[in-house]
Amino acid sequence: TIPPHVQKSVNNDMIVTDNNGAVKFPQLCKFCDVRFSTCDNQKSCMSNCSITSICEKPQEVCVAVWRKNDENITLETVCHDPKLPYHDFILEDAASPKCIMKEKKKPGETFFMCSCSSDECNDNIIFSEEYNTSNPDLLLVIFQ
């Protein structure tokens, strides 16, 4: 629970708690912003980001964005609040423990994004369809 000597709420800057009233601690994410990447045509890639940061807000999750255009490939790794869009997209998979890449429509480039909520989960980005929850076999495993 929130320690009694810690101010609970000031200037609408709430202390985030979980369902049991315990203080919610932030998670760790790879946080290299945008870097050039060699990740291409692979089932999964490591981020090759050497910076792990404590997210600024406890509600933030890890995000990875993979982009490919005519000139280069980049990988972006950050923390982000799933209540807010990122690159104009909702983080619909924010509760996932793994960063499963989903393609998004962006003109002029190939654009994949994933989000996840376990420590450093955006270090390993997964493109393979076998991890995708749209796969009926995986859904069967999840709900058994």
Epitope: D18, A22, V23, F25
Partner: nanobody, 122 residues
Framework: EVQLLESGGGLVQPGGSLRLSCAAS???????QMWWVRQAPGKGLEFIS?????????YYANSVKGRFTISRDNSKNTLYLQMNSLRAEDTAVYYC???????????????WGQGTLVTVSS
């Protein structure tokens, strides 16, 4: 009974240094994940540094990276925060906290010290 007692706070000029300590008792200190968390006047909690056990891996918030260093001495049951290149925006009450999984996925017990005030001002 778990106890965490912070010390080392005070008034320091911008650019100066301070070393905070957190004396722990009532639990096996060497096996616990420990944090430094701060609360600036009129603000929410900011989780600035974490040190794991075993292994002692350390992590920092972007706001303090390169300026603050977390460490622990398991033989003395003490957690430290070395703060260099202090800025006015580092003014806050600094708490040490310990966090341990309950055994139920995604839930934790946490314990907090009473805090020590750091004021950075000329």
């Amino acid at each position: 009974e778990v106890q965490l007692l912070e010390s080392g706070g005070g008034l320091v000029q911008p650019g100066g240094s301070l070393r905070l300590s957190c004396a722990a008792s009532g639990f096996t200190f060497g096996t616990e994940q420990m944090w430094w968390v701060r609360q600036a006047p009129g603000k929410g909690l900011e989780f600035i540094s974490r040190i794991d056990s075993p292994g002692g891996r350390t992590y920092y918030a972007n706001s303090v990276k390169g300026r603050f260093t977390i460490s622990r001495d398991n033989s003395k049951n003490t957690l430290y925060l070395q703060m260099n290149s202090l800025r006015a925006e580092d003014t806050a009450v600094y708490y040490c906290a310990k966090r341990r999984p309950t055994g139920v996925s995604g839930t934790f017990y946490d314990y907090w010290g009473q805090g020590t005030l750091v004021t950075v001002s000329s």
